[in-house]
C-alpha cells in the first residue's frame, strides 16, 4: 500500500482543516488508514483522524482544531496499521479556504432597489471576521447568458443594486462566496443560492 498523491490540506481558520490524498489503488480509507496530527507546541497531544473515502483510491480527513493561530504548525503522520506511509507538516494560516457565507437574503421591498444581505461565517473574535471580502453571483434562470458577478470589497456583508439593472418579470438566483486577502486565501465554496422574482415599475417614456 502506497500513497500516490501526498496529502494536501486547507483550513477554515476556525475549527476544521480538510486533508485529501490518493492511494495507489482502491482503499477502504476508514478501516485501513489513520491520519495523526499534532500541534507543534509544548505538551500538545496527538489527535487521530479517521479518513473517509473520496472516490475509489481517494481519501479525505476532517481534522478538528480548537482554534487556529497564524504561527501554528502541525505535524501529520499517515499510518496503515503499524506502517508509516507518509510524514509531513501543515501550516493552517498558509492554506486557508474560508467558510462559505450563510443566510443570503434578497430584500425586494426597497423602492426599486435590491438589497442582498448575508452573514459573515466567522464569529467576531476570529481574525478573518474583519478581513473577508465577497463576490456575489446573480444569474437568470431563463437566460444562461444573463450571468453577472459583483465584487464586494468593503467589509459589510451586503450589496445594493438597482432592480432595473436586471430584467423585469423573470426569476433570478443569487449566491455569495468569500475570500481574505490578508492570508491570500482561496475562495470559499458558494453559499446556497436564493431565488426571487424581479419586478419593478418601468419609468414612463417621455414623448
Amino acid at each position: 500500500m502506497k500513497v500516490l498523491q501526498e496529502p494536501t490540506c486547507v483550513s477554515d481558520y476556525m475549527s476544521i482543516s480538510t486533508c485529501e490524498w490518493k492511494m495507489n489503488g482502491p482503499t477502504n480509507c476508514s478501516t485501513e488508514l489513520r491520519l495523526l496530527y499534532q500541534l507543534v507546541f509544548l505538551l500538545s497531544e496527538a489527535h487521530t483522524c479517521i479518513p473517509e473515502n473520496n472516490g475509489g483510491a481517494g481519501c479525505v480527513c476532517h481534522l478538528l482544531m480548537d482554534d487556529v493561530v497564524s504561527a501554528d504548525n502541525y505535524t501529520l503522520d499517515l499510518w496503515a496499521g503499524q506502517q508509516l506511509l507518509w510524514k509531513g507538516s501543515f501550516k493552517p494560516s498558509e492554506h486557508v479556504k474560508p467558510r462559505a457565507p450563510g443566510n443570503l437574503t434578497v430584500h425586494t421591498n426597497v423602492s426599486d432597489t435590491l438589497l442582498l444581505t448575508w452573514s459573515n461565517p466567522y464569529p467576531p473574535d476570529n481574525y478573518l471576521y474583519n478581513h473577508l471580502t465577497y463576490a456575489v453571483n446573480i444569474w437568470s434562470e431563463n437566460d444562461p447568458a444573463d450571468f453577472r458577478i459583483y465584487n464586494v470589497t468593503y467589509l459589510e456583508p451586503s450589496l445594493r443594486i438597482a432592480a432595473s439593472t436586471l430584467k423585469s418579470g423573470i426569476s433570478y438566483r443569487a449566491r455569495v462566496r468569500a475570500w481574505a486577502q490578508c492570508y491570500n486565501t482561496t475562495w470559499s465554496e458558494w453559499s446556497p443560492s436564493t431565488k426571487w422574482h424581479n419586478s419593478y415599475r418601468e419609468p414612463f417614456e417621455q414623448h
Epitope: F41, L42, L43, S44, V69, S70, A71, K91, S93
Partner: antibody
Amino acid sequence: EVQLQQSGPVLVKPGASVKMSCKASGYTFTDYYMNWVKQRHGKSLDWIGTINPYNGGTGYNQKFKGKATLTVDKSSSTAYMELNSLTSEDSAVYFCARSLLRRRGAMDYWGQGTSVTVSS
Amino acid sequence: DIVLTQSPASLVVSLGQRATISCRASKSVSTSGYGYIHWYRQKPGQPPKLLIYLVSNLESGVPARFSGSGSGTDFTLNIHPVEEEDAATYYCQHIRELYTFGGGTKLEIK
C-alpha cells in the same frame, strides 16, 4: 474568582531539598496548564517547566532538568514543585502561573510567589 | 533556543506621552503575521500581569491604551497615553517548544 495560593517563604541549607505548593481555586484545575517561573532578585523571569494537570504530562527547561520536579494532586487542585540539591543560585522567588493552550501558553493568573533562601 | 532581546533596558516617559518597547527575537517566531508572543507588566513585590497575548490581543480588563504589534522577529508594545500607574518593568515572552522571557524594560514616568 480565580486564585493561585502559594506556600510561604522558606529558608533552607545548601544541599537540601524543598517542595512548594500552589493551590488553585475558582476554575477547573485540569483545564489549564500550570507553569513555574523563577525570578532572582532584580532579574528577569526564567521559565522552569510546565505540567498538564489533566494527564500529568510535563515539559522542562533543559537547564532545570534534574533540579526541578513538577507534580499535581488533582483531588486537591494543587500543583507542586520540588527543588533538590539546593545552592545559593537557587535563592529566588518562584511563581506558579496557569496558561491555556488556546492562548498558546499566555499566563493569565499568577500566584503571589514563594521566596526560597538558601543559606548555611 | 530563541533569545529575546528587549530595548531599551530602561525608559523615562512623560505623563501622557507614548512609551514604545521593542522585543527582538534571534530568529523568526511567526509564519505569517502573528507569533506566540505575549507581554507582561510587573511591579515591585508583585507577580507579573498579562497585558497582551498572541502579539496584539488585549487581555480582559487591560486598558485600551496598551497595544501590541509585530511579526517575524520584531515585536512592539505601545502605551499611549502613559499614566502614573504604568511605572513598572515590562517583559515580552515567546512560547513554542520552550518558553522564553525577554530581559525586561523598566519604565519610569516623569
